[in-house]
């Protein structure tokens, strides 16, 4: 009897949908695996007789529930199928946005870039998929614990009247208010302000 794949899960970030599993212990030899998806009531092969322990399902429609399954195989024997259900638009993890940052005197000018979606047009981003897309931004003076949160109205924000010659760190994440779903924070970008341009009277 061939044991089934273990720890079957979907690792999906920005609609890059990778079904992953672990190979079970099997004394007779090396196992191969077949992964399938349900399409119009018929299961279609996606990865056949692969020695890998993952299969890319990024071409699935972003909408609706998908049934995926994987089994282990050895010679003419095979395990039972292990099924999972996956809805990309609900289940995918929102990856970190990008950020353009420019220091102008005692201000930090930021523009936010929604994560790109692989296997789509060059310009297609997560913002195109989710109507309510917005950003959460947090910033802090480096070396301090106090963080300030803002929700920009647009894809850009300016932090003004910052302390001169001080390093500030900024990070951003995508947020979907209608789903109350937050994405992953970007790694902080840290920049040092320069002088305060106001002229003393």
């Amino acid at each position: 009897m061939v044991p089934p794949p273990e720890n079957v899960r979907m690792n999906s970030v920005n609609f890059k949908n990778i079904l992953q599993w672990e190979s079970p212990a099997f004394a007779k030899g090396n196992l191969t695996f077949t992964a399938q998806y349900l399409s119009y009531r018929i299961f279609q092969d996606k990865c056949m007789n692969t020695t890998l322990t993952e299969c890319d399902f990024s071409s699935l429609s972003k909408y609706g529930d998908h049934t995926l399954r994987v089994r282990a195989e050895f010679a003419d024997e095979h395990s039972d199928w292990v099924n999972i259900t996956f809805c990309p638009v609900d289940d995918t993890i929102i990856g970190p946005p990008g950020m353009q940052v420019e220091v102008l005197a005692d201000s930090l000018h930021m523009r936010f870039l929604a994560p790109k979606i692989e296997n789509e047009y060059e310009t297609w981003t997560m913002k195109n998929v989710y109507n309510s897309w917005t950003y959460n931004v947090q910033y802090w003076k480096n070396g301090t614990d106090e963080k300030f949160q803002i929700t920009p109205q647009y894809d850009f924000e300016v932090l003004r009247n910052l302390e001169p010659w001080t390093t500030y760190c900024v990070q951003v994440r995508g947020f979907l208010p209608d789903r109350n779903k937050a994405g992953e924070w970007s790694e902080p970008v840290c920049e040092q302000t320069t002088h305060d341009e106001t002229v003393p009277s």
Epitope: G95, P96, G98, M99, Q100, V101, E102, L113, N142, G143, T167, C169, E184, S186, E187, P188, V189, C190, E191, Q192
Partner: nanobody, 121 residues
Framework: EVQLVESGGGLVQAGGSLRLSCAAS????????MAWYRQVPGKQREWLAR????????NYADSVKGRFTISRDNTKNTMYLQMDRLTPEDTAAYLC??????????????KSQGTQVTVSS
């Protein structure tokens, strides 16, 4: 494409030390910050330490302060994590992450695959 590749993981006895490396490769113009995280299956990813690339300024999580040291080598585009006085609770997959710019001023977050560190008692 920018890639972060770490090395230096492995099996170590409690009380011992390990040094992890995280090398950034590919075409990029600058690094703003890099950080170390660790992940135990079924648990939240834990931030450990961060370094600001330009100045070398560092920050640490309380759980590793005094035991772990983050550093970087600008000339090699490589970050390090020196881990001392390791305990079995430090067993995890260790990952690095960075805010890296391929075009001047536009930073994206890049992450490594992870390297396993196992501390035996």
């Amino acid at each position: 494409e920018v890639q972060l590749v770490e090395s230096g993981g492995g099996l170590v006895q409690a009380g011992g030390s390990l040094r992890l490396s995280c090398a950034a490769s590919g075409s990029f113009s600058s690094i703003s910050t890099m950080a170390w995280y660790r992940q135990v299956p079924g648990k939240q990813r834990e931030w450990l330490a961060r370094i600001i690339w330009s100045s070398g300024a560092t920050n640490y999580a309380d759980s590793v302060k005094g035991r772990f040291t983050i550093s970087r080598d600008n000339t090699k585009n490589t970050m390090y994590l020196q881990m001392d006085r390791l305990t079995p609770e430090d067993t995890a997959a260790y990952l690095c992450s960075g805010a890296i710019s391929q075009t001047r001023g536009t930073f994206w977050t890049y992450k490594s695959q992870g390297t396993q560190v196992t501390v035996s008692s």
